[in-house]
Structure formats: C-alpha cells, structure tokens
C-alpha cells in the first residue's frame, strides 16, 4: 500500500499524517529516522507472514530459499499535479523477524541516488512478527525537473530489493526550448522562423503571430517552422504555445529588412602631406547588413577641370584612409560612400582638404666649386632651381661635402638660407678628395641633390683647382 | 509529390444532386484546406468554400451557401463537394485546390478539374 | 465582396518581348494576392503569392509587384507558351475573389 496527496504543511511532523500500510498494532508509536540515515532496524522481534501484494525482489541468492520473500508493497504507480503544488508519496516494506541483517531504504530517481537534503523520512513500526518501515519522500513546490521516476531500494540479508516506481509527471504551461530568433533578411525574400514548446501536458500547439495579428489560421504540432514567403517592411513575430494548462507566448523578435546604408557621416583630415591626405569618417547605421567595403571619391576643388573624380575603394574598417599620389599645395573635396550586400550608401557631405607645399623635385643648376688656398676654404656657387609654386617657398639649401683621402672619410652638410647662391666651406683635410652636392629646401621639404661635383685638395702650398658646372653623373673634374 | 485527383465527369438532370470527390496524396492532408472553385465556360474563376479535414471547419461563400456542402474524409484523405438542386446555371468545371493553414499562402496545387453537366 | 479588376480582357505582345497585367482591387488587401496561368483545358497554375513571391518551379521570367490595391504581373522575354490566360486572386478576406483574366496573344 501507498499513499500520494497534494499538501500544504511544511512541519516534518504534519506531513505523514495519511493512512499507513500494513498491519500495526495500535499500542507501537512508530519510530523514525531521517532519509539519509543508515542506521539497522531495532532488534528482531517475532516471525510474521508475509503481506500478499508485494513487489517482486530483484535479485534471488542462494539464502534467499530458506527465507520467506520480501519485497516492498504496491504503491501509486502514477502521480499527475501541477506545477509548483507539493507532493507527498511513500515505499512500504514488512521484514519479518526471521530477517538479521537490513540496512536503511534509500531514494533513487532515474536511476540516481537521491543523496542530501531531500524531504524524506523513514519510519518504523515493530510488533510481535517483524518490523513495517515506511519511507516517505515529499517534494515541496514541484518543478518540471521533478519529472521522472521515483523508487526505494533496500538491502536485506544481504540481497537489494528494489520498489515499483512511482512515476511523477509535473504538469504546466508549455516551455520553449526554441524561440524565434531575430534576423536581418532580404526584401522579398523567404525565411525561417523556428519555434518549439513541450509540456508536459502534450500536445503542444503552436500559433504564430506577426505584428499581433495569427499568421496560421491553425494551430501547428510543436515543433513548428514558419515559413515567411518575404518581407517588404520590418515586423515583430511570436509565438503562441498551448496546452491543456493554457498558453505561453515567446518572446518578440525583430525582422528587418536589409536597405542600403545609410551615408558616412563625420569625415574629418586627420593629416595632411604634400603628396596625400589622412581621412576619416563615421560610418552610417548599417542597413542591417554588414558594411562591406567604402569607397573615397576625391575632385579637384579648385580647378577648372572636368570635374573627374578619383575613387579610392578601402575595406569598411578601420573607418580611415591614406589618399596617396595627390598634388603638393592643392586643394580637394573629399568625400565617402559604403557598401552592404545590398548596395551603395549615398555619399558622405563633401568636405574641403588641401595637401601641404612640396619639396623641390629639381636640383639647384651649375655648380662651380673653387679651391681658395690663401684662405683655406672652398668657394662653392649654384643657380637657384626652377621651383614651381607647389614646390613651396624656397627656405634655404643644404650642402653635403664629403672628404676622402687615405685612411680618412669625412661626411658633412651644411645648412644656408636662400639669400644668395654661394657659400664658403672651411677645407677639412688636405691631400683629399671633395665630392659637393646642394639641394634646395622649401618649407615642403628638402629636394633632391644635385649631381656630385668633385675638387681635389692638394698638400699645403701646391694648388689645384677645379671650376664645374653640373656634370654627369660620375664625372669628376680636376686641375 | 502533391496531387489532387478529382472523380471523373458527370451527367445530371435538372433538380438532381451531385457529390464529386478530390483525392489527395503527397502531403498532409489533414493540415491544409481544401478549396473548391467553380469555372464556367469562357468564364472567370469563383471561389465556393474550403474545408479543414483536421477538425472538419469550413467556411463558404455566400453566393453557395445551400448549393454546396463540403465535407472531407480524413481516413482516405478525400474531400467532397456536394451540389443539390442543379439547374443549367451549375453547369462548370469544379476544381479542387490545396491551401497551407498560413495566411502567406493561397492555392498551390490544384486538381485537375471535373465537368458537371445539368441536362434533362 | 472585394472586386478584383483586370483592366485588359486581352494584352498583345511578342515572343521576346516584356509586358506587363495590372490588377486592382476595390480595397487593400495587404499583399495577399496571387496570380495564376491557366492553359485551355487544364486547371489554374500558380505563378506568383504574396504579391511577389514566386511558386516553386516558376521561371524567373514572371515578377509580381504592389501592394495594397494595385498589383502587376510582369513576364520579361515572352516565350510562346506563355501566350495564354492569367488570373489575380485576394485571400485577404473571405469569400476569396478572382479577377476575369487577362488573355496574353500574339500581336
């Protein structure tokens, strides 16, 4: 015999009250022991028989012959409640005296001991012919983790004995295990949406629900997939889950339509150079699609051009940009467009940049060198270099004089404003070689250096001179 | 595949009563409706009603309501449509057509279309 | 009832060529129109649903487009067995109604 009822009673002592198995003499109080407890049963006392509706043993021994069966009683089989109700059911077993060893009833689930703090009491009844033990189990506000099967074991004389199982079914609201998930899709273009609910109770059916309106007229078993034939604008779908316990509704999720993004915004110069232009930008909201790649349209601003646009095409981050190859001292107008799958961003406002001045890109022209012994310095003039307006203001020029005779390698410049076309360089070493170059600077940079000219320095008092304009490469004039 | 197969033609005198079946394979049956639509000869297309064969639901056209009767036999996966009362007006081709429970969705397969004469 | 108007009881066109059959219907209906093609003797074929969404096996050639009240079935390069009758339909709102049909012919 079993007993399995709804309860409300948290006290230890309140919660068994039901109708006990067995025959039990009304003179023994009972005796009880926590679940997880092992204690032996109290000494035996007198054979009894044996109750007629017993379970069946598991496990037979050798001894088991010479001893009358024991088993645990029929209990519920099959215990139906609701959600968060409590629950309360019982393993009953009567050991006749005959039986020396036992040891305690233990709780198992699935196949799992159930160990710890579980609700659970055993409690004893001896009289003349043995002894009835009671296991209770009691769940308090049971969830669906709850579910499954419940059942005693118990060892006598050696041998397991194992109950009937009582099966507890929770029931409740349906409970997603798979919700619609939010996407981004193509307009016009079909889709998936996945939803899955269980109860117990089942079935579980499914309605789907676009911006609040049912999309199926009928219910769908669980698990339901819709198929949206195509979107023109962005929607919200649901799912709507029943059972026999009532309905759960999913969350909501967006669908939105993939458009073309929308233009960058915040272009700034974060540097400029003669020859390019350092950019950046924001980008737009991304239409709902990943941006792909950017592209930076640059137009001469102030030119009486045909308007052509360069185009620079750069992956969509970092959301910057080396315009290179540019013209020195001009100014452009710059502006940024981005890609998704679906297409091209409007462009970006155009904004105003200007490169920097250049450096010269011509060598200044006719470069003597003379040798002046009395005074021991060399005596250097050029002709200022042709310096277009881009190559900037001219600042000045630099002159590398590099000394070599045996065993010595002098390398020097020299820095002189642009006032004039000469300078006067002190002779570093004698019975050597000078190579002299010149470069012309601007506030852009330093140009390039013109071709070598070479004079030789003789020894004190001996004196060669060597007068140049600009040779040819690797032409070395001497006297 | 999805196919509908209709019963074949039939002759009736004026007055008289008709049943034409619509037998259904290669899908759900019970999960989708079944609509019938008449077609006159050189004439449009009229919708007369569907029928849900997992609960029996239907729904008709007003214009049919007391001409036509739709039924459905989920066992054999047949739908009927009965026609009583036949005059020369009833004259037409009667399809069968498939519909999902799914508001996107509208007739994707249809039988193949069974000419009914009303002739004394 | 909603009335689903098909302006032309018949279109001209050539093989190759791309034409176009309108619809309208008396009140909004969404995007719940379909169009069907319909063969001398053989029951309707569904072409396009939802508007735009074309029916399994549909060649590429057929288009649908519109939304509310007026719809539009296109059929870029023609092909001689496209030269027959097509139907719009509403599943908006019940009873279902059909339009009369366009016949597509040879010019």
């Known amino acids: 015999g079993g007993t399995a009822e709804k309860w409300e009673e948290t006290e230890l002592d309140q919660l068994f009250s039901g109708p006990l198995p067995g025959r039990l003499p009304v003179n023994h109080r009972p005796f009880s022991a926590p679940h997880s407890s092992r204690d032996q049963l109290p000494p035996p006392q007198t054979g009894r028989s044996h109750p007629a509706h017993t379970a069946a043993p598991q496990v037979t021994s050798t001894a088991s012959k010479l001893l009358p069966p024991v088993a645990f009683n029929h209990t519920i089989g099959h215990i139906v409640l609701s959600e968060h109700k409590n629950v309360k059911f019982n393993c009953s077993i009567n050991i006749p005296n005959t039986y020396q060893e036992t040891a305690g009833i233990s709780w198992w689930k699935d196949g799992k001991e159930l160990l710890g703090a579980h609700h659970s009491i055993t409690q004893f009844y001896p009289d003349e012919e043995g002894v009835s033990i009671i296991a209770l189990f009691s769940i308090a506000s049971v969830q669906r983790s709850d579910n499954g099967s419940y059942f005693c074991k118990m060892k006598v004389n050696n041998r397991e004995i194992v109950s009937d199982p009582i099966y507890v079914e929770v029931q409740g609201l349906p409970y997603f295990i798979k919700q619609p998930e939010s996407v981004n899709v193509t307009r016009n273009t079909a889709f998936n949406l996945t939803c899955q609910a269980v109860g117990p109770p089942e079935p579980v059916n499914i309605f789907w629900v676009q911006n609040s309106s049912r999309v199926n007229e009928k219910p769908e078993r669980s698990p339901s997939v819709l198929t949206v034939p195509g979107l023109t604008e962005t929607a919200v779908f649901s799912c709507e889950a029943h059972n026999d316990k009532g309905l759960t509704v999913s969350k909501g999720v967006h669908i939105n339509i993939k458009v073309i993004p929308s233009p960058p915004t915040e272009v700034h110069i974060l540097n400029s150079t003669a020859h390019s232009i350092l950019v950046s930008w924001v980008p737009g909201f991304d239409g709902y699609s990943p941006l792909q790649n950017c592209s930076i349209q640059v137009k001469e601003a102030d030119r009486l051009s045909n308007g052509s646009v360069m185009v620079f095409n750069t992956s969509a981050s970092p959301h910057l940009y080396e315009i290179q190859q540019l013209q020195a001292l001009a100014n452009y107008s710059i502006a940024v467009s981005c890609r998704n799958e679906i297409g091209w961003s409007a462009v970006s406002p155009w904004i105003l940049a200007s490169t920097t001045e250049g450096a010269p890109s011509v060598a200044p022209l006719n470069i003597t060198v003379f040798l002046n012994e009395s005074n021991n310095i060399l005596d250097i003039r050029w002709t200022k270099p042709p310096i277009k307006r881009q190559d900037g203001e001219l600042v000045g020029y630099r002159i590398s004089h590099v000394w070599e005779s045996a065993g010595t390698y002098k390398e020097l410049s020299e820095e002189v404003s642009q006032n004039g076309s000469w300078a006067q360089i002190p002779v570093q070493i004698h019975n050597a070689t000078c190579t002299v170059r010149i470069a012309a600077i601007t506030k852009g940079g330093i140009g390039p250096f013109s071709e070598p000219v070479n004079i030789i320095i003789p020894e004190h008092s001996k004196v060669d001179y060597a007068p140049s304009s600009t040779p040819a490469p690797g032409n070395t004039d001497s006297m | 595949q999805v196919q509908l197969q209709q019963s074949g033609p039939e002759l009736v005198k004026p007055g008289a009563s008709v049943k034409i079946s619509c037998k259904a394979s290669?899908?759900?049956?019970?999960?989708?409706?079944v609509n019938w639509v008449k077609q006159r000869p050189g004439k449009g297309l009229e919708w007369i009603g569907r029928i849900y064969p997992g609960d029996g639901d239907s729904n008709y056209n007003g214009n049919f309501k007391g001409k036509a009767t739709l039924t459905a036999d989920k066992s054999s996966n047949t739908a009927y449509l009965q026609l009583s009362s036949l005059t020369s007006e009833d004259s037409a081709v009667y399809f069968c057509a498939r519909k999902s429970h799914f508001i996107y969705y509208t007739l994707d397969y249809w039988g193949q279309g069974t000419p009914v004469t009303v002739s004394s | 009832d909603i009335v689903m108007t098909q302006s032309h009881k018949f279109k001209s066109t050539s093989v190759g060529d791309r034409v176009s059959i309108a619809c309208k219907a008396s009140?909004?209906?969404?995007?719940?129109v379909a169009w069907y093609q319909q063969k001398p003797g053989k029951s309707p074929k569904l072409l396009i649903y939802w508007a735009s969404s074309r029916h399994t096996g549909v060649p590429d050639r057929f288009t649908g487009s519109g939304s509310g009240t007026d719809f539009t079935l296109t059929i870029s390069n023609v092909q001689s067995e496209d030269l027959t009758d097509y139907f719009c339909?509403?599943?908006?709102?019940?009873?279902?109604?059909f339009g009369g049909g366009t016949k597509l012919e040879i010019k």
């Open positions: 290669g899908y759900a049956f019970s999960s989708s409706w």
């Open positions: 339909q509403q599943y908006s709102t019940y009873p279902y109604t």
């Open positions: 009140q909004d209906v969404g995007t719940s």
